[in-house]
């Protein structure tokens, strides 16, 4: 398939509740009606799939399988949120976008967003 540019932020810090959000923007060369978005995690040269979604332009994202991701779409932007993150999940999260209909199919892979996750300190015991 043909190449397409995908932009995403370089760094994001997850919240204390283990939630990280970032925008994945793609330069659509045509009038795609069906889009797939996959989030990949790269750590120690290993690449694993975090979640995947498919949607019709103008409709809500449908995340596939039991997903830790949620998101919304607006034009050529996808707002992604990953939940349940812990310190061990720190890594490079890559946004992959595929325009699946109509042909020609396009594929774009972002440079990745480094997500830092810091586990919150446990609350000290309180004497009341």
């Amino acid at each position: 398939c043909k190449a397409m540019h995908v932009a995403q932020p370089a760094v994001v810090l997850a919240s204390s509740r283990g939630i990280a959000s970032f925008v994945c923007e793609y330069a659509s060369p045509g009038k795609a009606t069906e889009v797939r978005v996959t989030v990949l995690r790269q750590a120690d040269s290993q690449v694993t799939e975090v979640c995947a979604a498919t949607y019709m332009m103008g409709n809500e994202l449908t995340f596939l399988d039991d997903s830790i991701c949620t998101g919304t779409s607006s034009g050529n932007q996808v707002n992604l949120t990953i939940q349940g993150l812990r310190a061990m999940d720190t890594g490079l999260y890559i946004c992959k976008v595929e325009l699946m209909y109509p042909p020609p199919y396009y594929l774009g892979i972002g440079n990745g967003t480094q997500i830092y996750v810091i586990d919150p300190e446990p609350c000290p015991d309180s004497d009341f």
């Epitope: 398939c1 045509g30 009606t33 069906e34 799939e49 995947a52 498919t54 949607y55 019709m56 449908t62 596939l64 399988d65 595929e98 209909y101 109509p102 042909p103 020609p104 199919y105 594929l107």
Partner: antibody, heavy 123, light 107 residues
């Protein structure tokens, strides 16, 4: 009823080209992608590429890029697959098959197939 | 490219037997999978799409299941007309590759 009728068998010399046609009837030609798949004798199925008859948009399997050319004629509801620089390993049955209705998520299914066209490449 | 590994490559079974064919993808294909039946000299015929949805007019003895990378086609009670070769195909990322096929023969 939906029908995809392909052109007849061809015998070609190595280095030459072949053009296979696929005439669609029984549905709106521009509402469905047309895919091409081939099958060498006694072997499995191999996806060649896809064309959207409405827009002319095409995606090829990288393996065939530069050698395969897909076209579609809306006026006659006919799709074509041309393969150039033929070699003996291109001897196969070539199928056209339609996929899904326009713009329907999850409609990933090749539901109707042509009868196949045997292309024999031999010196 | 996503590799589709089908097993077994062939099997012998009797009429009435329960037959299971598996297809493993080299990465998660999220149920974007179809199964086809092919008889000698004929074009493939759609059996199942979206991993588990039966095609129009396909007998209910055929069923598809699975998720992620592992998928199964089951024939609950093999009939004489079911002796054929079966192929899986993914629709996740192009090229949309097929499995190598499973030939179901009469025992």
């Amino acid at each position: 009823q939906v029908q995809l009728v392909q052109s007849g068998a061809e015998v070609k010399k190595p280095g030459s080209s072949v053009k296979v046609s696929c005439k669609a009837s029984g549905y709106t030609f521009t509402d469905y992608e047309m895919h091409w798949v081939r099958q060498a004798p006694g072997q499995g199925l191999e996806w060649i590429g896809v064309i959207d008859p409405e827009t002319g948009g095409i995606t090829y399997n990288q393996k065939f890029k530069g050698r395969a050319t897909l076209t579609a004629d809306k006026s006659t509801s006919t799709a074509y697959m041309e393969l150039s620089s033929l070699r003996s390993e291109d001897t196969a049955v070539y199928y056209c098959t339609r996929r899904g209705a326009r713009a329907t998520v999850y409609n990933y299914v090749m539901d109707y197939w042509g009868q196949g066209t045997l292309v024999t490449v031999s010196s | 490219d996503i590799q589709m590994t089908q097993s077994p490559s062939s099997l012998s079974a009797s009429v009435g037997d329960r037959v299971t064919i598996t297809c493993r993808a080299s990465e998660n294909i999220h149920n974007y999978l179809a199964w086809y039946q092919q008889k000698p000299g004929k074009a493939p015929k759609l059996l199942v799409y979206n991993a588990k949805t039966l095609g129009d007019g396909v007998p209910s003895r055929f069923s598809g299941s699975g998720s992620g990378t592992d998928y199964t086609l089951t024939i609950s009670s093999l009939q004489p007309e079911d002796f054929a070769t079966y192929y899986c195909q993914h629709f996740w990322s192009t090229p949309w590759t097929f499995g190598g096929g499973t030939k179901v023969e009469i025992k």
